[in-house]
């Protein structure tokens, strides 16, 4: 019998209101054993996958998706979904990214060795 998969959660670091040119990292969370996390835009045809999964807690896994330099085109709703064999989960709630600008780019904190690097969403993955 297939298990019921909990809905993933989505959050953004450092928040959901981001100055133009700054970075944002979306964090998707699900149960242990998730093979693929997917970050989707409002249209399901634009998404990014990762199998680079970490422990968030003894009972949770997480994946991070970083956009290094936010533009107006990055504004809008995002949600997470995951694949835990043999099926995909439901989608998370939407998280709305707001881009503030034009403003001066804040001081760059990319020298933090723990900060994830850039990975923007691409529209090349279609269902």
């Amino acid at each position: 019998q297939e298990e019921d998969l909990p809905r993933p959660s989505i959050s953004a670091e450092p928040g959901t209101v981001i100055p133009l040119g700054s970075h944002v990292t979306f964090v998707c969370r699900g149960p242990v054993g998730v093979q693929t996390f997917r970050l989707e835009r409002e249209s399901r045809s634009t998404y990014n996958d990762t199998e680079d999964v970490s422990q968030a807690s003894p009972s949770e896994s997480e994946a991070r998706f970083r956009i290094d330099s936010v533009s107006e085109g990055n504004a809008g709703p995002y949600r997470c979904i995951y694949y835990k064999p043999p099926k995909w989960s439901e989608q998370s709630d939407y998280l709305e990214l707001l881009v503030k600008g034009p403003t001066q780019r804040p001081s760059d904190n990319s020298h933090n060795e723990h900060a994830p690097a850039s990975q923007g969403l691409k529209a090349e993955h279609l269902y």
């Epitope: 990762t50 199998e51 900060a115």
Partner: antibody, heavy 119, light 107 residues
Framework: EVQLVESGGGLVQPGGSLRLSCAAS????????MNWVRQAPGKGLEWVAR??????????FYADSVKDRFTISRDDSKNSLYLQMNSLKTEDTAVYYC??????????WGQGTTVTVSS | DIQMTQSPSSLSASVGDRVTITCLAS??????LGWYQQKPGKAPKLLIY???SLAEGVPSRFSGSGSGTDFTLTISSLQPEDFATYYC?????????FGGGTKVEIK
């Protein structure tokens, strides 16, 4: 079909250096963390090093036994994983496996390359 | 570092036997545990991930149970191809440590 093919093993003297390579195919290399695991003759498995993806700034992690001597790296444009081994010791003699990390677990293994450190 | 203690280190069994291998973590790891099978001269193969999930292509006679610190790998009916060495591994925190292995031999 997922394939991980290691190369670069061989005989080296104590204190010497060696660079292992792993050619990956059959999957989207740049979305997976990757690892090196070794197995000394007649012994168990020992995790050596791990490298994460661009989303994590290619963060690296090492076993204490190899820290400051070994360096893991990757070239996503070449679908390749590397292990630079310096200041080699006799206890580094082992079969070295390239391992694809999936869901945090070691889902796919190469067939291994043998490193012998001896004078 | 999290220590993984596997027992027994070896066992003798016959085809058709039910075999149980245990793994004890020195601190709680939730279900961040994998089980691997290794045959002589071959690379290890993932059997179970997330403590209880069967890896792709693995026969259903293999099963995993447990969470926290105590874990079990069970082979419900041992087959000739199952004679091998089995390892547990915690993937909760680095260093990603393995158990010492359990060699399953023919009685």
């Amino acid at each position: 079909e997922v394939q991980l093919v290691e190369s670069g093993g061989g005989l080296v003297q104590p204190g010497g250096s060696l660079r292992l390579s792993c050619a990956a195919s059959g999957f989207t290399f740049n979305i997976n963390a990757m690892n090196w695991v070794r197995q000394a003759p007649g012994k168990g498995l020992e995790w050596v090093a791990r490298i994460r993806t661009k989303n994590y700034n290619y963060a690296t992690f090492y076993a204490d036994s190899v820290k400051d001597r070994f360096t893991i790296s990757r070239d996503d444009s070449k679908n390749s994983l590397y292990l630079q081994m310096n200041s080699l010791k006799t206890e580094d003699t082992a079969v070295y496996y390239c391992v694809r990390d999936r869901a945090g677990f070691f889902a796919y293994w190469g067939q291994g390359t043998t490193v012998t450190v001896s004078s | 570092d999290i220590q993984m203690t596997q027992s027994p280190s070896s066992l003798s069994a016959s085809v058709g036997d039910r075999v149980t291998i245990t793994c004890l973590a020195s601190q709680t790891i939730g279900t961040w545990l994998g089980w691997y099978q290794q045959k002589p001269g071959k690379a290890p193969k993932l059997l179970i991930y997330a403590a209880t999930s069967l890896a792709e292509g693995v026969p259903s006679r293999f099963s995993g149970s447990g969470s926290g610190t105590d874990f079990t790998l069970t082979i419900s009916s041992l087959q000739p191809e199952d004679f091998a060495t089995y390892y547990c591994q915690q993937l909760y925190s680095t260093p990603l440590t393995f158990g010492g292995g359990t060699k399953v031999e023919i009685k």
